[in-house]
Interface confidence: low
């Protein structure tokens, strides 16, 4: 009520001031009434402070500063070059899909899907990953064969209290091979790509854990897990990289109702990891060797390891029976890359970032969209770029390395006043020649201020125009790295800048 009264007073006082202005009242009188109006508005503002809108990004989202964007673009560049090197095409799909498209594809994670408010038309949801839209794209376009990559944002209603270091809007970088091929060749290439990218990014030692959904399901069957509990027990097993077996067992027994002896049998298997020798050992296992699914999975893994040796990455791969990635659509090989250590300063704890890339085979997903249930075998991987961004950012902060946020090659500066026209002409010439150039937006900037900006921005070169130089038809070109300064003829400037910045001929 008080606020409403105050708003009314402001309105009336405003009208009074406008009236005085229309009547051309004296300046003093108008000023006096304006002062009153401002005081009333200030009172209103204080009152407003109690319920003021807090300016922030929505929970689970963030802005990217130019510095962060520079890091991000470098990471994307490494990833895209690798995807292209392996012959991938690129696609894009809508940020939102029909709700029905995403329904029933993510198991327990479905509750994390963002549904859009119904506007009286289609029921829509924001995409949760890039894989389900890819499967929809294949089915819709009746494609049976494609190798594609897709880099885009996805949306998940993760509970921030439960999932630290995770966002509700984040990038995924996916590479997938769809088509009927001989077993394990595309799967091996996906693992090769994963290793190439993680090595190129130089974020530290990593290990890729490999398992197979069929081995897991076969193992659960021989251990006595009821079919209905396979998926929920899978999610418990998947926690073994973070907590002890004891805790996982407690969850399976206490929370999920599994018999303790069944849990113990699972424990005997899932605590094992190794290489191809473990695969061979399990093929001889009296129980597993009797399970058709498990034998199929183990046979494929044996073949996979042969290809991994040929690709020269077998030392980076570990067969790990506890790997049980949560998504419902995996049907065969599954894999997940984890960072083993993080280059930190002595005495600091290593950064625990968990999974940095993952993927697997999902042969049934496209069939879910096909009216006749026709299947398109698919295998793919996803690079956890958000985690990689934060590792790279932290590493750069620790090293205090300067990150350039622009690609400017040359700053056009002037040594004296009244040279704005000359700077504008020169910068325009450089732009037209495809040179990345900048100038300070002041008529008469001090040379010192220009040079300070040049150094702080990390621009490699500065072209300095002076009155004497103009008369002589030269430009002074100074290098930030060597501090040397040379006179370059105006007509040779573009070529000299290109030479010094190793830029091939290009124009806009």
């Amino acid at each position: 009520a008080d606020r409403a009264a105050l708003e009314e007073l402001v309105r009336l006082q405003g009208a009074h001031v406008r009236g005085l202005k229309e009547q051309k009242a004296s300046a003093e009188q108008i000023e006096e009434e304006v002062t009153k109006l401002l005081k009333l508005k200030a009172q209103l503002g204080q009152d407003e402070g109690k319920q003021k809108f807090v300016l922030k990004t929505p929970k689970g989202t963030r802005d990217y500063s130019p510095r962060q964007m520079a890091v991000r673009e470098k990471v994307f560049d490494v990833i895209i070059r690798c995807f292209k090197r392996h012959g991938a095409e690129v696609i894009d799909t809508p940020v939102f899909e029909l709700k029905e498209t995403l329904t029933g594809k993510y198991g327990e994670d479905s509750k994390l899907i963002y549904d859009l408010k119904d506007q009286g038309g289609e029921l829509l949801s924001l995409r949760y990953d890039l894989t389900v839209p890819f499967a929809r794209y294949l089915a819709m376009n009746k494609l049976t064969n494609i190798k594609r990559y897709h880099i885009a944002k996805v949306y998940r209603r993760d509970n921030p209290a439960m999932t630290r270091g995770r966002y509700r809007e984040f990038y995924q970088c996916d590479f997938d091979i769809a088509g009927q091929f001989d077993p394990m060749i595309p799967d091996a290439e996906c693992l090769k790509i994963m290793c190439e990218i993680l090595s190129s990014l130089q974020i530290g030692n990593f290990l890729v854990k490999v398992n197979d959904r069929r081995i897991l399901d076969g193992m659960f069957a021989v251990c006595g897990v009821p079919d209905s509990k396979f998926r929920t027990i899978c999610s418990s097993v998947d926690k073994l990289d973070k907590v002890s077996w004891e805790e996982v067992k407690n969850e399976m027994v206490g929370e999920k109702g599994l018999a303790p002896e069944v849990a113990d049998r699972i424990g005997d298997y899932v605590q094992q990891h190794g290489g191809v020798s473990l695969v061979e050992q399990l093929l001889q296992d009296p129980k597993l060797s009797q399970n058709k699914q498990a034998v199929e999975g183990l046979g494929d893994l044996k073949l996979l390891f042969e290809y991994l040796i040929l690709f020269g990455i077998d030392d980076k791969i570990s067969f790990d029976l506890s790997l049980a990635r949560g998504l419902d659509y995996y049907t065969g090989v599954i894999y997940e890359a984890v960072l083993l250590q993080m280059p930190t300063q002595a005495g600091e704890e290593p950064l625990g970032v968990g999974s940095i890339a993952a993927g697997g085979r999902y042969d049934g997903l496209v069939g879910m969209f096909d009216p006749k249930g026709r299947k398109v075998p698919c295998v793919g991987l996803s690079i956890g770029v958000e985690r990689i961004f934060s590792i790279v950012e932290q590493r750069l902060e620790a090293s205090e390395e300067k990150v350039r946020t622009t690609e400017t090659q040359v700053l056009v500066a002037s040594a004296q006043k009244k040279l704005l026209e000359e700077r504008l002409k020169l910068v325009s010439e450089l732009w037209d020649a495809g040179i990345k150039a900048e100038l300070l937006y002041k008529k008469n900037p001090k040379l010192l201020n220009q040079l300070q900006y040049w150094e702080e921005a990390g621009i490699p070169l500065v072209a300095i125009i002076g009155e004497q130089e103009l008369r002589d038809g030269v430009i002074k070109l100074r290098s930030v790295a060597s501090r040397e300064e040379v006179d370059v003829r105006r007509e040779d400037l573009v070529e000299e800048i290109r030479r010094r910045t190793n830029q091939p001929l290009s124009t806009c």
Epitope: K59, G60, R62, P160, A161, M162, T163, R164, G165, R166, Y167, K239, K242, V243, N250, G254, E255, E348, E349, L351, G352
Partner: antibody
Framework: QVQLVQSGAEVKKPGASVKVSCKAS????????IGWIRQAPGQGLEWMGD????????NDNEKFKDRATMTADTSTSTAYMELSSLRSEDTAVYYC???????????????WGQGTLVTVSS | DIVMTQSPDSLAVSLGERATINCQSQ?????????MHWYQQKPGQPPKLLIK???NLESGVPDRFSGSGSGTDFTLTISSLQAEDVATYYC?????????FGGGTKVEIK
């Protein structure tokens, strides 16, 4: 070893604001959340909210949503809790505590600060 | 909010005897699973985590302390009370925001 050191006792008038700090050491500040819990004289514990410095998430107890602001400065590994429009019933010891984060299970609080007594009196 | 009801409010037990504290959560959902934690608070000190997730003993806590229960009913047991166990004990759930605490149980020596 993990330590949370809080700022000293404060005496405030009704309507004023108070800002309590909590400096963390002995672990990677951005890997864990910091919760704020208060305890009125002779009373039990009341959770006010938490902040996760690694991603600047805050979780708020609706009861304090309009008055409590939780922030964190990662450069100094310090968390802050500011409570505005103080009233006499806000007189309490305010604790910060580290959220024990484990496999995305909900939090227990494994390390606590020594507490900051805030007295609100006219 | 989930209401946590702790009982009894206070408890006097002879040295070496068993002390049992109960905590019941009136949860909106059917169950709070085992997201229940127990703290010990001595006068003038901050609370100290004893047991997390209903039954997991925090490192450095004597094994005379144990926790049990699931669903909505949880128990903290001190198998053989020692003089240094005189304190107020609180349960806390972390099933949904806001986390809430029980009212506390004051344990004294008889």
């Amino acid at each position: 070893q993990v330590q949370l050191v809080q700022s000293g006792a404060e005496v405030k008038k009704p309507g004023a604001s108070v800002k309590v700090s909590c400096k963390a050491s002995g672990y990677t500040f951005t890997d864990y959340c910091i919760g704020w819990i208060r305890q009125a004289p002779g009373q039990g514990l009341e959770w006010m909210g938490d902040i996760c410095p690694g991603d600047t998430y805050t979780n708020d107890n609706e009861k304090f949503k309009d008055r409590a602001t939780m922030t964190a400065d990662t450069s100094t590994s310090t968390a802050y809790m500011e409570l505005s429009s103080l009233r006499s019933e806000d007189t309490a010891v305010y604790y910060c505590a580290r959220g024990e984060e484990q496999l995305g299970l909900r939090n227990a609080m494994d390390y606590w600060g020594q507490g900051t007594l805030v007295t609100v009196s006219s | 909010d989930i209401v946590m009801t702790q009982s009894p409010d206070s408890l006097a037990v002879s040295l070496g005897e068993r002390a049992t504290i109960n905590c019941q959560s009136q949860s909106v959902s059917t169950s709070t699973y085992n997201y229940m934690h127990w703290y010990q608070q001595k006068p003038g000190q901050p609370p100290k985590l004893l047991i997390k997730y209903a039954s997991n003993l925090e490192s450095g806590v004597p094994d005379r302390f144990s926790g049990s229960g699931s669903g909505t009913d949880f128990t903290l047991t001190i198998s053989s009370l020692q003089a240094e166990d005189v304190a107020t004990y609180y349960c806390q759930h972390s099933w949904e925001i806001p986390w809430t605490f029980g009212g506390g149980t004051k344990v004294e020596i008889k």
